[in-house]
Interface confidence: medium
């Protein structure tokens, strides 16, 4: 079951999965000036079998200037940017990825990848926060988040965490002892707060134009 | 032709902010349905080659609409034009109702 | 590529509908109904999986290049056309659509 939406944005903060979930997707996306080749894959697909997981189809990006050539090398690490999504900006090591059953290693990068890496998720994963540089970790409770399915309803839960503008950086995921707060609203697995995601969606004309349109809307 | 098509769609019952992708998709009378286009709330796109020098997609999250813009339009281009959410791995659920959209010169 | 272009079949008889990809899709591809006037609706996707609300006379299977969707026992509201999707390679595209109508 994929999650209804993006893990939840935390001021200052950034987040990693340490391991993907099978069924996760990650897009297949191209920079400024590269587009997926004809007949390219959409995105990757964590899948496995009994015996490991690993990720199905190959993103590829040839120029758009350019027609029938692709390359799938492996960037240089200078040409690695930062990957607004989930990539962190200090390193990591807590979670052996290759331990944990039913998970992806993180995708190798390729070559000419967008900046932004737009994963899907699926219930169960869980994700990990970390201050950005120039930002310290004041923890309320865990600094991750976890898809889960309530009532039907997909949800993740709150991070527990506040990056305060002091010039220290914490490490990964956060070596400060959690401090028990009166603010922090712990999550509850009871209580359903009752919402519709029965998505409706409609048309309307945004502009005349030039030459004459004429429009009729279905009903 | 020097037109330029534009057409919102609107969002209810849940956020344009939500893991999906927000789609464009036409279809000329009697003929099968052409996709066109999407957007992800980051702003992230993507375009069908045969138009992409043609088409923007846009994405308004405070109004949880997002648009479509076609430039120089011709009679080719005279088509129903559906938005739809599309969900990575099971394809387009719901639609909008559907624009007709006549270009004539 | 779908076929056959138009089917025609009498109420309460079994329908089937066919995709060919022109390279494997694995099972990324969807089924949809358009009746006249109307939004197309998500029958199935992921090549088998009902969509939410859609009736167990509804089946689809197949994997790499080959697809069927079987309705199997079409009722009055069943006649429509229906297009199959393939989502996994770029750009995502649609098939020319089955038209199954009244015999």
């Known amino acids: 079951e994929l999650c209804d939406d993006d893990p939840p944005e935390i001021p200052h903060a950034t987040f990693k999965a340490m391991a993907y979930k099978e069924g996760t997707m990650l897009n297949c996306e191209c920079k400024r000036g590269f587009r997926r080749i004809k007949s390219g894959s959409l995105y990757m697909l964590c899948t496995g079998n009994s015996s490991h997981s690993s990720w199905d189809n190959q993103c590829q990006c040839t120029s758009s200037a350019t027609r029938n050539t692709t390359k799938q090398v492996t960037p240089q690490p200078e040409e690695q940017k930062e990957r607004k999504t989930t990539e962190m900006q200090s390193p990591m090591q807590p979670v052996d990825q290759a331990s944990l059953p039913g998970h992806c290693r993180e995708p190798p990068p390729w070559e000419n990848e967008a900046t932004e890496r737009i994963y899907h998720f699926v219930v169960g994963q869980m994700v990990y926060y970390q201050c950005v540089q120039g930002y310290r970790a004041l923890h309320r409770g865990p600094a991750e988040s976890v898809c889960k399915m309530t009532h039907g309803k997909t949800r993740w839960t709150q991070p527990q965490l506040i990056c305060t503008g002091e010039m220290e950086t914490s490490q990964f995921p956060g070596e400060e002892k959690p401090q028990a707060s009166p603010e922090g609203r712990p999550e509850s697995e009871t209580s359903c707060l009752v919402t519709t995601t029965d998505f409706q969606i409609q048309t309307e004309m945004a502009a005349t134009m030039e030459t004459s349109i004429f429009t009729t809307e279905y009903q | 032709p020097s037109g330029t098509l534009s057409l919102t769609c609107a969002v209810s019952?849940?956020?344009?902010?939500?893991?999906?992708?927000w789609s464009w998709v036409r279809q000329p009378p009697g003929k099968g349905l052409e996709w066109i286009g999407e957007?992800?709330?980051?702003?992230?796109?993507n375009y069908n080659p045969s138009l992409k020098s043609r088409v923007t997609i846009s994405v308004d999250k405070s109004k949880n609409q997002f648009s479509l813009k076609l430039s120089s339009v011709t009679a080719a281009d005279t088509a129903v034009y559906y938005c739809?959410?599309?969900?990575?791995?099971?394809?387009?659920?719901?639609w909008g109702q559907g624009t007709l959209v006549t270009v004539s010169s | 590529t779908q076929s056959p272009g138009t089917l025609s079949v009498s109420p309460g008889e079994r329908a089937t509908l066919s995709c060919r990809a022109s390279?494997?899709?694995?099972?990324?591809l969807a089924w949809y109904q358009q009746k006249p006037g109307q939004a197309p609706r998500l029958l199935i996707y992921?090549?088998?999986t009902r969509a939410t609300g859609i009736p167990a006379r509804f089946s689809g299977s197949g994997s790499g290049t080959e697809f069927t969707l079987t309705i199997s026992s079409l009722q009055s509201e069943d006649f429509a056309v229906y297009f199959c999707?393939?989502?996994?390679?770029?750009?995502?595209?649609f098939g020319q659509g089955t038209k199954v109508e009244i015999k």
């Open positions: 999707q393939q989502y996994t390679n770029w750009p995502q595209t």
């Open positions: 992921g090549a088998s």
């Open positions: 390279q494997s899709v694995s099972s990324r």
């Open positions: 957007i992800y709330h980051s702003g992230s796109t």
């Open positions: 019952g849940g956020s344009i902010s939500s893991s999906n992708w």
């Open positions: 739809a959410r599309g969900v990575r791995g099971t394809g387009f659920d719901p």
